[in-house]
């Protein structure tokens, strides 16, 4: 099966790598613009230079292209706790990340929020916190894991999933209550 190509891909495939087909004259292949620049004017003829201009401040192109405009630089989302790792340059978009001892929770492929890594109080670190994953904790006896925090079994209600982990404690509490009714 032949993969489906978009119009731009079809046009580009006619020309050698690093060149694109002139939009008004399909017998001319123009040289693509370098990263950090954009297409101002197509080349006037074969072997003649494409008119490429450098991206203005606040915009970029990260690869060779024949874009009519540079792409706008991304802004790190402060409301998501993001910080700027590196500023936008003409040939590279802004790089956003999280502070030390934080991890990224991805709401979608292009949106993440920063959260503090769990410290595993009343437990031990099973897997260390990573860029895109919170610490995985293992709880000490008498504690159960709820939303990645070790919570005392005294907070375990019978309807919750903690009942198996906290069964001895629940039995003890029940036994104590029963012994006081004689």
């Amino acid at each position: 099966l032949v993969p489906h190509l978009g119009d731009r891909e079809k046009r580009d495939s006619v020309c050698p790598q690093g060149k694109y087909i002139h939009p008004q004259n399909n017998s001319i292949c123009c040289t693509k613009c370098h990263k950090g620049t954009y297409l101002y004017n197509d080349c006037p003829g074969p072997g003649q230079d494409t008119d490429c201009r450098e991206c203005e401040s606040g915009s970029f192109t990260a690869s060779e292209n024949h874009l009519r405009h540079c792409l706008s630089c991304s802004k790190c989302r402060k409301e998501m706790g993001q910080v700027e790792i590196s500023s936008c340059t003409v040939d590279r978009d802004t790089v956003c990340g999280c502070r030390k001892n934080q991890y990224r929770h991805y709401w979608s492929e292009n949106l993440f929020q920063c959260f503090n890594c769990s410290l595993c109080l009343n437990g031990t670190v099973h897997l260390s916190c990573q860029e895109k994953q919170n610490t995985v904790c293992t709880c000490h006896a008498g504690f159960f894991l709820r939303e990645n925090e070790c919570v005392s079994c005294s907070n375990c209600k019978k309807s919750l999933e903690c009942t198996k982990l906290c069964l001895p404690q629940i039995e003890n509490v029940k036994g104590t209550e029963d012994s006081g009714t004689t």
Epitope: H105, W107, S108, E109, N110, L111, E147, N148
Partner: nanobody, 121 residues
């Protein structure tokens, strides 16, 4: 076919409460992050709150922190927004939205038709 149907909007006095619901169908609800987004008259869209698949991770806009609570019931395929201490500036159409998984120009791929919340005395 994906469908998101909001309900629970209405007219409420300042300081009052409302609970919005969003009934989801046409997809595996528990596998997707969900959101509430609002649009006030003549203004742009504002993210209100997000909730993760299992409900453990949430996001709230600063303007609603401490007043609104997002929750979900995956067994009922329903998303909720409990709105307390409502203010005039909360007046807007509230939309339930499903996060897209793959990269798109928008982070949401499906929206409900919206429910109007009016806060006025």
């Amino acid at each position: 076919e994906v469908q998101l149907l909001e309900s629970g909007g209405g007219l409420v006095q300042p300081g009052g409460s409302l609970r919005l619901s969003c009934a989801a169908s046409g997809f595996t609800f528990g596998e997707y992050n969900m959101a509430w987004v609002r649009q006030a008259p003549g203004k742009g869209q504002e993210w209100v709150s997000f909730i993760s698949t299992g409900g453990h991770v949430t996001y709230y806009a600063d303007s609603v922190k401490g007043r609104f609570t997002i929750s979900r019931d995956n067994s009922k395929n329903t998303l909720y927004l409990q709105m307390n201490s409502l203010r005039a500036e909360d007046t807007a159409v509230y939309y339930c939205a499903k996060f897209s998984v793959r990269f798109r120009s928008s982070i949401f791929d499906y929206w409900g038709q919206g429910t109007l919340v009016t806060v006025s005395s």
